[in-house]
Interface confidence: low
Amino acid sequence: AFGISGVQKYTRALHDSSITGISPITEYLASLSTYNDQSITFALEDESYEIYVEDLKKDEKKDKVLLSYYESQHPSNESGDGVDGKMLMVTLSPTKDFWLHANNKEHSVELHKCEKPLPDQAFFVLHNMHSNCVSFECKTDPGVFIGVKDNHLALIKVDSSENLCTENILFKLSET
């Protein structure tokens, strides 16, 4: 896993430029883990980055992800997750120039190298759940969330609001 060293390469200037005409409200460096406390890790393999969901040993450092928060341009129909009636969206970047992307055709979550402005596939609507958990809904495919499937991240369709609390789409953010 490369997360810590990769994140240290960030500079403020990199993230001060506007993305699709919007600048981040704020940014936040955190490790990402599942509801069941498995860590989300990133590894360089064959010149591409792979994403894993795994148990870390006690002394292993968690990878960090830079979350950039944005206000959407469209009013939110939801209550509680919005910013003054607008949806709150995030991009997730574990290392410089790489962002998590939703591949809706393959129902997969991938790390892509890209330049700004970022494509819509890199934006996720952030839902604020109980017990310090969040979930990430695809901007490009409402009702589809980042989730855990077979020790990997995948896109999971949630067909009703009752299933929003399904454990496999809940994630924890931590600064340690």
Epitope: I25, T26, Y28, A30, Y69, D81, G82, V83, D84, L88, L126, N128, N132, V134, L173, S174, E175
Partner: nanobody, 123 residues
Framework: QVQLVESGGGLVQPGGSLRLSCAAS????????MGWFRQAPGKEREFVAG????????LYADSVKGRFTISRDNAKNTVYLQMYSLKPEDAAVYYC????????????????WGQGTQVTVSS
């Protein structure tokens, strides 16, 4: 602009209890650490209690330890201060505060303040 709106203040007898609430108009978690401060007439604003933004770790002023409990409901964008065994010296205007950092505790580091709610402790 983050707006913090406090409620729950009022008049209570010594030994009584109150629960203060602070609702945020904008998304809190995980951007802001939240806290409560108070200011009595003629005194400086002081830290009462704080709660970290990504954990339930709490911090209290010595004067309220064991009597006050801070908590947050991230899904409701609300932070609470449950106050037990109130004393006359607890009387003050209580302010909700938010800081764009992991912890909160120093009055000078607060990014956003509520308008305050009055707590009066008198028989």
């Amino acid at each position: 602009q983050v707006q913090l709106v406090e409620s729950g203040g009022g008049l209570v007898q010594p030994g009584g209890s109150l629960r203060l609430s602070c609702a945020a108009s904008r998304f809190i978690f995980p951007i802001y650490a939240m806290g409560w401060f108070r200011q009595a007439p003629g005194k400086e604003r002081e830290f009462v209690a704080g709660i970290e933004r990504t954990t339930d770790t709490t911090l209290y002023a010595d004067s309220v330890k064991g009597r006050f409990t801070i908590s947050r409901d991230n899904a409701k964008n609300t932070v609470y201060l449950q106050m037990y065994s109130l004393k006359p010296e607890d009387a003050a205007v209580y302010y909700c505060a938010a800081r764009n950092s992991r912890r909160i505790g120093d009055v000078n580091d607060v990014d956003y303040w509520g308008q305050g709610t009055q707590v009066t402790v008198s028989s």
